[in-house]
Interface confidence: low
């Protein structure tokens, strides 16, 4: 139609100018479009330079929209992480503060002369929670061994107790149970509780990190072309106000975000595992009950030692022989009063319940984040036509969009009519993030069963599913050798990656 040749390019001028480009590039009226590389080659209001500028701009706009969506998710995960982390640290700090306030009065020198040992225990629990390479059972075993030596000496200042005698005491300890049931109970409960808490918080961190890294994955050149065609070619071809057909938009974005959609299965597995592990936050072995009550187990242990002192001493003498009397030493220490025990069950504050119910709801909301991205971006960012009618932009003209909508993920894009996707070349960054999701899910599943994946016994038969390379700490491949209870090293062992100062500090 000759009349269309002289059609004004006013609408394109407005859009192009609003994008910050120079209006001197825009033709006054339509020109022949043989020069176009992306848009259909009819009469057009776009020069080659305009087409290139708009292609770059549409690419940048999609990347920005993608980053915006990711940022919202990242912010949610980071907020969750901070809330849970604050709560768990608060529980442990509360327990330590209670201990520091009550133990001097309850146990006198039995506590004050060993305050450093207790402080170090809390430091190590804190470090373990934060992800440090230490074996919680080892840490607790060493703590009790050191404490027994020190308290036994204090309870018998009239005796000379050389190292070899203390070695013998240490060897007898397991059978004698000098601290009663408290060490065993604390070990069983603390291991489960700390493993659950730390793996849940790590899960939030890994999820957030995956989103951050995937948001940085650049969109390929084929995607650029397809998005240009989707968003701006209608303007170049003088089809004013034609909004993209919904299925057309979905196909473009499913092609552009094919690799991202491949995160879906492992992302769901991770979030499911995180929701599942919150079950371990309740009950007598639950996070709140145990982490906030460490001091009560410690009090119970010292009480048990005092109650059993005479029997214990007799059995130790029976097994290790009569120790020499210390001529300078005072008489045997008077039996102390029992330290009053706080109720072991912390009444739930309600804070954790609120945090967990919010987290569960939010994690469920974002389960289909990766596969719903094309739909989300199409509806929110593209101002789509409301119906698949004959009036929407289908990439060539106004009219119905006929091709079917592709499935999700890379493999399903083999016949995508809008974006040429090489399904044999998955994005390396995204593959790496899929592996990280697998590793973290593996940790959470182990944690659900009360195991720290970094310390699976060498005696395990190795059966069961797993991600192969699923270890994030160097201790995965190495079981720490149990220090014999006779080696009198300081309670703070050198923790890799932490200065001595940091290893000893308390909040």
């Amino acid at each position: 139609d000759p009349a269309s040749k002289s059609r004004s390019c006013g609408e394109v001028r407005q859009i192009y100018g609003a994008k910050g480009f120079s209006l001197s590039d825009v033709p006054q009226a339509e020109i022949s479009g043989e020069h176009l590389r992306i848009c259909p080659q009819g009469y057009t209001c776009c020069t080659s330079e305009m087409e290139e500028n708009l292609a770059n701009r549409s690419h940048a706009e999609l990347e920005t929209a993608l980053r915006d969506s990711s940022r919202v998710l990242q912010a949610m995960l980071a907020t969750q992480l901070r809330s849970f982390d604050d709560h768990f640290q608060h529980l442990l700090n509360d327990s330590e503060r209670t201990l520091q306030a009550t133990f001097p009065g309850a146990f006198g020198e039995l506590y004050t002369q060993n305050a450093r040992a207790f402080r170090d225990l809390y430091s190590e629990l804190r470090l373990y929670y934060r992800g440090a390479n230490l074996h919680l059972e080892e840490t607790l075993a060493e703590f009790w061994a050191r404490l027994l030596e020190r308290l036994f000496k204090q309870l018998h200042p009239q005796l000379l107790l050389p190292d070899d005698y203390l070695d013998c005491l240490g060897k007898q300890a397991e059978a004698l149970r000098p601290f009663g049931e408290a060490p065993r109970e604390l070990r069983l409960r603390a291991t489960r509780a700390f493993v659950a808490a730390r793996s849940f918080v790590q899960g939030l961190g890994v999820a957030s990190d995956v989103v951050r890294k995937v948001a940085q994955v650049p969109l390929g050149p084929e995607c650029s072309r397809a998005v240009m065609k989707l968003v701006y070619c209608a303007h170049c071809l003088g089809v004013p106000g034609a909004r993209p057909c919904p299925d057309y938009c979905r196909n473009v974005l499913k092609g552009c975000l094919a690799n991202q959609a491949d995160l879906d299965a492992e992302w769901r597995n991770l979030l499911d595992s995180m929701v599942l592990i919150t079950d371990k936050f309740w009950g007598t072995s639950g996070v709140e009950s145990v982490i906030g009550s460490v001091h009560t187990w410690l009090a119970e242990a010292i009480n048990a030692l005092q109650d059993n002192r005479d029997t214990l001493t007799a059995k130790v003498i029976q097994g290790c022989g009569n120790p020499k009397v210390n001529p300078q030493g005072p008489g045997p220490e008077e039996k102390r009063r029992r330290g009053k025990l706080a109720p072991r069950e912390r009444p739930p504050s309600g804070t954790l319940e609120k945090l967990v119910s919010e987290a569960k709801a939010q994690l469920r909301d974002v389960q289909d984040f990766w596969i719903s991205l094309p739909g989300t971006l199409c509806s929110e960012k593209m101002a789509l036509s409301t119906a698949s009618d004959d009036r929407c932009w289908n990439g060539m003209a106004r009219g119905r969009y006929l091709p079917e909508v592709m499935g999700d993920g890379l493999a399903n894009q083999i016949n995508n009519p809008e974006v040429e996707v090489d399904i044999t070349k998955p994005d390396m960054t995204i593959r790496q993030q899929i592996m990280q999701l697998k590793i973290m899910t593996n940790r959470l599943r182990s944690a659900y069963n009360g195991n720290d994946v970094d310390f699976q016994d060498a005696s395990d038969d190795g059966s069961g599913s797993g991600s192969g390379d699923g270890c994030l700490d160097d201790l995965c491949s190495r079981k720490v050798s149990r220090k014999s209870s006779s080696s009198r090293t300081p309670l703070t062992h050198a923790l890799p990656g932490l200065s001595e100062q940091e290893g000893q500090k308390t909040s």
Partner: antibody, heavy 130, light 102 residues
Framework: AVTLDESGGGLQTPGRALSLVCKAS????????MFWVRQAPGKGLEFVAG????????PYGSAVKGRATISRDNGQSTVRLQLNNLRAEDTGTYYC????????????????????????WGHGTEVIVS | ALTQPASVSANLGGTVEITCSGG???YGWYQQKSPGSAPVTVI????NRPSNIPSRFSGSTSGSTATLTITGVQADDEAVYFC??????????FGAGTTLTV
Amino acid sequence: AVTLDESGGGLQTPGRALSLVCKASGFTFSSYTMFWVRQAPGKGLEFVAGIDNTGIYTPYGSAVKGRATISRDNGQSTVRLQLNNLRAEDTGTYYCAKYADACTGPWCGSSAYTASTIDAWGHGTEVIVS
Amino acid sequence: ALTQPASVSANLGGTVEITCSGGGNDYGWYQQKSPGSAPVTVIYDSINRPSNIPSRFSGSTSGSTATLTITGVQADDEAVYFCGSYDSSYVGIFGAGTTLTV
């Protein structure tokens, strides 16, 4: 420009301890995982230790596991390697190296475990155990 | 350790490929001109090239094998090339090195 300067090498006595320091500049040190890699005379590269940006994740190569401690001071932009109970086979050039990508998330520990993503190396410091 | 050929040779201006296998998902390639001199990263994370490295160096992976390709080989490319990755216990490892003779 990124620079990594190692120091602390020289002639060492078997059975004693060694402390190497790497001073970094030209990048935001606290955002990057760091490594120590060594090379025995006439041999290939060997992973010694890695440390993530927070200092929590610290994997060690099998030859030094149990004898080495890697630590970092983000304020001073330094990473330190302490190697105890030195042996003749610890002789070689020790290089400080940097992970390619910054980590701003709270848990980037996995970066300390791979030798696939190093983008900068120091000139090395020579250690002779004799 | 990672498996890579002990040596490869190339003609000036030709193309050469060095392979590496036995590691995890990602590989790095490090060039060392002489023993004791600092390595230089030519490829990291399998495919990324630092900005100061010429475009004739490229990396790719297929399955569990990584390949360093140098197109238009120059005399200055003569060196030992080490690959790096991680092992099954997720700790860093390097290959024994491949000597490129031009």
